[in-house]
């Protein structure tokens, strides 16, 4: 698999995977006590035909061409966990594995 | 997790999973030996914002709201593979599971 | 820059009670644990339980439970240690320093900031 | 509750000496120890955290090591403005407990 990484100076059009630090404490979600803050990255960009698809799925859509079926767009085909630390609903304290919470690649899907 | 099945009557207009049966045949893709057709269905429909969200990290993006993000997008968020026997390169037959050829649920991401 | 000022020196009677403040400033106070610490005069230190402003979870020291209240005034970024039926071996300077996390592991955290500290006496 | 022995309770050391405090636990603490410097009439300060690890504008001249039960700060090189009350502490579990201190004197 195959994934373009960008920044904000980058002058790619093409979905690509951008830097995002998410911070909880700017947020206002002080019930995350640990990490305050951490690097979640994006995905931003176009998606023509073929370029960067993640499914042979995508490009079949594309060929039936059904009612209402968009072009694909530019999302993340990988991503990883964060170890968090965090208060629950009952107000206990939970370290737990987040999925799904780091963008590793991006794809058009 | 939940996702939306729809069908060519339906009137939503969020993200669903709608029917659509590709034909190889009618593709002229006369490599693939079997299955001549298959269900694969799409994906499609609107994405308001925590409506049907695979990940909190698309949440989060939201809030961030980095330059150049658009709102998530109605996208397979589970997938399964079919047997598929099919013509390689070097003209051998081959039968083996295609992984992400059928969407099973439709999300936001 | 992240600050913890505490309230002027103390004299209390035996039997009665005394409510010592740290306010917070340079940081957002809500999203991080307290902790009081105290100290007898020539003596070490002796940790005395924590708070989380965001919702008034506290653990403390079974060595004070029956007599230690925290809380927290998030309105004004302020927090509490109350100390009920003083006795003289409670004269001690009483710090509040706030819990910093390296880390997202229970323990993965250490004091990064001190209040200047606060002197109760208890005294007849 | 987790007891910590530190040793020497005091100790006199010239300008330039290498010193060490040694920090015993009663019980494994996972490397989770911190050490404090406190300066008479102040409010202690962070040195290391997690063992081994340098406080943020903390010189490295102090150095933390150990695991399991045993721990050490050592100071390489002596100067006028090291010399105060150092503390170990666990956060292994609560309560938190504290080393009773070492005092540093000037020889």
């Known amino acids: 698999d195959f994934g373009l990484d960008c920044d904000e100076h980058s002058t790619e059009s093409r979905c690509c995977r951008y830097p995002l630090t998410v911070d909880f404490e700017a947020f206002g979600w002080d019930w995350i006590i640990a990490p305050k803050r951490y690097k979640a990255n994006y995905c931003s960009g176009e998606c023509e035909f073929v370029f960067l698809q993640k499914y042979p799925h995508t490009h079949l859509v594309h060929q039936a061409n059904p009612r209402g079926s968009a072009g694909p767009c530019c999302t993340p085909t990988k991503m990883s966990p964060i170890n968090m630390l965090y208060f629950n609903g009952k107000e206990q304290i939970i370290y737990g594995k987040i999925p799904a919470m780091v963008v590793d690649r991006c794809g058009c899907s | 997790d939940f996702g939306l099945d729809c069908d060519e009557h339906s009137t939503e207009s969020r993200c669903c999973r709608y029917p659509l049966t590709v034909d190889f045949e009618a593709f002229g893709w006369d490599w693939i030996i079997a299955p001549k057709r298959y269900k694969a269905n799409y994906c499609s429909g609107e994405c308001e914002f925590v409506f049907l969200q695979k990940y909190p990290h698309t949440h989060l993006v939201h809030q961030a709201n980095p330059r150049g993000s658009a709102g998530p997008c109605c996208t397979p968020t589970k997938m399964s593979p079919i047997n598929m026997l099919y013509f390689n390169g070097k003209e051998q037959i081959i039968y083996g599971k295609i992984p992400a050829m059928v969407v099973d649920r439709c999300g936001c991401s | 820059q992240v600050q913890l000022v505490q309230s002027g020196a103390e004299v209390k009677k035996p039997g009665a009670s005394v409510k010592v403040s740290c306010k917070a400033s340079g940081y957002s106070f809500t999203g991080y644990f307290m902790h009081w610490v105290r100290q007898a005069p020539g003596q070490g230190l002796e940790w005395m339980g924590n708070i989380y402003p965001y919702n008034g979870v506290s653990n403390y020291n079974q060595r004070f439970k029956a007599r230690v209240t925290m809380t927290t005034d998030t309105s004004t970024s302020t927090a509490y240690m109350e100390l009920r039926s003083l006795r003289s071996d409670d004269t001690a300077v009483y710090y509040c320093?706030?819990?910093?996390?390296?880390?997202?592991?229970?323990?993965?955290?250490?004091?990064?900031?001190w209040g200047q500290g606060t002197l109760v006496t208890v005294s007849s | 509750d987790i007891q910590m022995t530190q040793s020497p309770s005091s100790l006199s050391a010239s300008v330039g000496d290498r010193v060490t405090i040694t920090c015993k636990a009663s019980q494994d603490i996972n490397s989770y120890l911190s050490w404090f410097q406190q300066k008479p009439g102040k409010a202690p300060k962070s040195l290391i955290y997690r063992a081994n690890r340098l406080v943020d504008g903390v010189p490295s001249k102090f150095s933390g090591s150990g695991s399991g039960t045993d721990y050490t700060l050592t100071i390489s090189s002596l100067q006028p403005e090291d010399f105060a009350t150092y503390y170990c502490?666990?956060?292994?579990?609560?309560?938190?407990?504290f080393g009773q201190g070492t005092k540093l004197e000037i020889k």
């Open positions: 320093a706030r819990r910093y996390y390296y880390d997202t592991g229970p323990a993965d955290w250490y004091f990064d900031v």
């Open positions: 502490l666990q956060s292994d579990e609560f309560p938190l407990t």
